[in-house]
Interface confidence: low
């Protein structure tokens, strides 16, 4: 329904709070590098002027939509040129194309300083001392390092990193109610964060229709009583809320995302009965707990696919007459009853049943061709929970840690031209999946592992994007969104990879490696062992093994000793003597 | 349902050790952050120590730091505390709380192990 302003429009409809807060992000995700302080004047004027149109829709100005109001008011930066170079050239385009060109420059590794977390004290006098730019500041430094992170759902963090502060800061002990919250809230929103990436990317590289097929088969499994006239409508609304929040059009966004919850809500007995208690909370946390909402319980009796997607005689009727409808039914109805499958996996099987129908139609007897479609799946089923199994296996013989390095091994010698610091980032997030997954039952591993990495491989794909380096990670990137995790499996050492000339300067460590926390000294060692693999490729897991015990003995032999610089600089010379001579180098 | 269920208080001398469990049942233990925390007689709840649900992170309040060492079993869904060093000011009714992930309140509580430190 058309208003005469849009602006207007959804500042009524989101309120005050959340028009500042939604334009803040919208700002910080397009303009990462500009101060706070630039960004909250920016809203300030945005807010005023919707407030004037919210008294008189017909005021001048009123009736832009919200992409040239928004891009007119980023294009009013006065450093635009000195610190985003050629983005600035994006102003001189009329809208549409500058909107995109905005899009185009977002970037999934900002040059932005690591966020180092203050003393409890500290915080909570900040937030004490003024609450709404405490929490606006939290916005934008997260939106800024996630430019596409799912604004609505960063509302809801907001909401709960206030309710911390709220909480924790009148504490007996403020660091002990506070500090889990916040690494709580750090750690699943790194985790939202990569999750939503891949919705856009899937969105932007793969198109409109790769988005539906992923949501048709994960909301499939989620609400398998629902008809499939329901899960289409739900995944027509899906669709269009994330268009829009990766398109940069967060109030609507934030407002249609509202809507659907609304009518999830209203309808739950034809969609699922686990929504009761999500839809009885507030907005935010609704639309969170609806995201997250466990899988309904299967319908009993379900017929066997067979009757209607193989045995019938009209399956290439069905299949030319709407093919998109056809096929979204046999997703629909393969995932409602495979809640043990990865929707990836869902995805290839939908693509084999299609190709299969493609071919099968077209020849003199479609029937007897496609009469052992299912049993093409039967090797797609088996090489994921082959792979799960075997490195389940690995996980629960090695650990995290161990498991995480055996993985930096796998993928810097299957793709060695790709920087270190993604390399360590990757393979550390991959190798989580072990303790994420493995400990769940054989029905709900698949689901768990395969979809996982396909949101960590994605990450490996934006980042690579941005400085491309390798062809085979291009390669897999790019011809496939739900081949991608066996395109990687299947890439083997690379031979044409010329070794990495030795430095022992990537080698050298000083006494600073003692003071750091578990989690930062493991990187560092991971850092080391990716030089050493990108060094000698060849490199035997016993060598490296070898090499890497004698790394971990002496940094605690010179963290124990009096003069830690001494021992690290001499002691130090004799490890990369001995790795290089264990090593060959 | 929700069940958090204490263990293993009673009547120590200063100086001298015990070790608080509290079996859960009810939720997935394994993805949920968990705490301890106390009353002692006439007093407000104060926190003790709170466990991340991989076993790390952990933290403590500043009176028990160096004393107490909390730890989880996953695969038995049991949450521990175990209490060195104990002082008169340790006795209290200690309960086991699950950590909330979503909402800023505690969710479920168990009905609190009695701890009397005393010559």
């Known amino acids: 329904d058309a208003h005469k302003s849009e602006v207007a429009h959804r500042f009524k409809d989101l309120g005050e709070e959340n028009f500042k807060a939604l334009v803040l992000i919208a700002f910080a995700q397009y303009l990462q590098q500009c101060p706070f302080e630039d960004h909250v004047k920016l809203v300030n004027e945005v807010t005023e002027f919707a407030k004037t149109c919210v008294a008189d829709e017909s005021a001048e100005n009123c009736d832009k939509s919200l992409h040239t109001l928004f891009g007119d008011k980023l294009c009013t930066v006065a450093t635009l040129r000195e610190t985003y170079g050629e983005m600035a050239d994006c102003c001189a385009k009329q809208e549409p194309e500058r909107n995109e060109c905005f899009l185009q420059h977002k970037d999934d590794n900002p040059n932005l300083p690591r966020l180092v977390r203050p003393e409890v004290d500290v915080m909570c006098t900040a937030f004490h001392d003024n609450e709404e730019t405490f929490l606006k500041k939290y916005l934008y430094e997260i939106a800024r390092r996630h430019p596409y992170f799912y604004a609505p759902e960063l509302l809801f963090f907001a909401k709960r990193y206030k309710a911390a502060f709220t909480e924790c800061c009148q504490a007996a002990d403020k660091a002990a109610c506070l500090l889990p919250k916040l690494d709580e809230l750090r750690d699943e929103g790194k985790a939202s964060s990569a999750k939503q990436r891949l919705k856009c990317a899937s969105l932007q590289k793969f198109g409109e229709r790769a988005f539906k097929a992923w949501a048709v088969a994960r909301l499939s499994q989620r609400f398998p009583k629902a008809e499939f006239a329901e899960v289409s409508k739900l995944v027509t609304d899906l669709t269009k809320v994330h268009t829009e929040c990766c398109h940069g059009d967060l109030l609507e966004c934030a407002d249609d995302r509202a809507d659907l919850a609304k009518y999830i809500c209203e309808n739950q007995d034809s969609i699922s009965s686990k929504l009761k208690e999500c839809c009885e909370k507030p907005l935010l946390e609704k639309s969170h707990c609806i995201a997250e909402v466990e899988n309904d319980e299967m319908p009993a009796d379900l017929p066997s696919l067979a009757a209607d997607f193989v045995e019938s005689k009209d399956v290439c009727k069905n299949y030319a007459e709407a093919k998109d409808v056809f096929l979204g039914m046999f997703l629909y109805e393969y995932a409602r009853r495979h809640p043990d499958y990865s929707v990836v996996l869902l995805l290839r099987l939908a693509k084999t049943y299609e190709t299969t129908l493609e071919k099968c139609c077209a020849a003199a007897d479609p029937h007897e061709c496609y009469a052992k479609v299912f049993d093409e799946f039967k090797p797609l089923v088996e090489e994921p929970q082959n792979l799960i199994k075997q490195n389940c296996e690995l996980f629960e013989q090695l650990g995290e840690y161990k498991f995480q390095n055996a993985l930096l091994v796998r993928y810097t010698k299957k793709v060695p031209q790709v920087s270190t610091p993604t390399l360590v980032e990757v393979s550390r997030n991959l190798g989580k999946v072990g303790s994420k997954c493995c400990k769940h039952p054989e029905a709900k591993r698949m689901p768990c592992a395969e979809d996982y990495l396909s949101v960590v491989l994605n990450q490996l794909c934006v980042l690579h994007e941005k400085t491309p380096v390798s062809d085979r990670v291009t390669k897999c990137c790019t011809e496939s969104l739900v081949n991608r995790r066996p395109c990687f499996s299947a890439l083997e050492v690379d031979e044409t990879y010329v070794p990495k000339e030795f430095n022992a300067e990537t080698f050298t460590f000083h006494a600073d490696i003692c003071t750091l926390s578990e989690k930062e000294r493991q990187i560092k060692k991971q850092t080391a062992l990716v030089e050493l693999v990108k060094h000698k490729p060849k490199a035997t897991k016993e060598q490296l093994k070898a090499v890497m015990d004698d790394f971990a003995a002496f940094v605690e032999k010179c963290c124990k000793a009096d003069d830690k610089e001494t021992c690290f600089a001499e002691e130090g010379k004799k490890l990369v003597a001995a790795s290089q001579a264990a090593l060959g180098l | 349902e929700v069940q958090l269920l204490e263990s293993g208080g009673g009547l120590v001398q200063p100086g001298g050790s015990l070790r608080l469990s509290c079996a859960a049942s009810?939720?997935?233990?394994?993805?949920?952050?968990m705490l301890w925390v106390r009353q002692a007689p006439g007093k407000g709840l104060e926190w003790v120590s709170v466990?991340?649900?991989?076993?790390?992170?952990?933290y403590y309040a500043d009176s028990v730091k160096g004393r107490f060492t909390i730890s989880r079993d996953n695969s038995k869904n049991t949450l521990y505390l175990q209490m060195n060093s104990l002082r008169a000011e340790d006795t209290a009714l200690y309960y086991c709380?699950?950590?909330?992930?979503?909402?800023?309140?505690?969710?479920?509580w168990g009905q609190g192990t009695l701890v009397t430190v005393q010559s």
């Open positions: 709380a699950k950590f909330p992930s979503s909402r800023m309140k505690f969710d479920y």
């Open positions: 009810g939720f997935t233990f394994d993805t949920s952050s």
């Open positions: 466990i991340h649900q991989s076993g790390t992170p952990t």
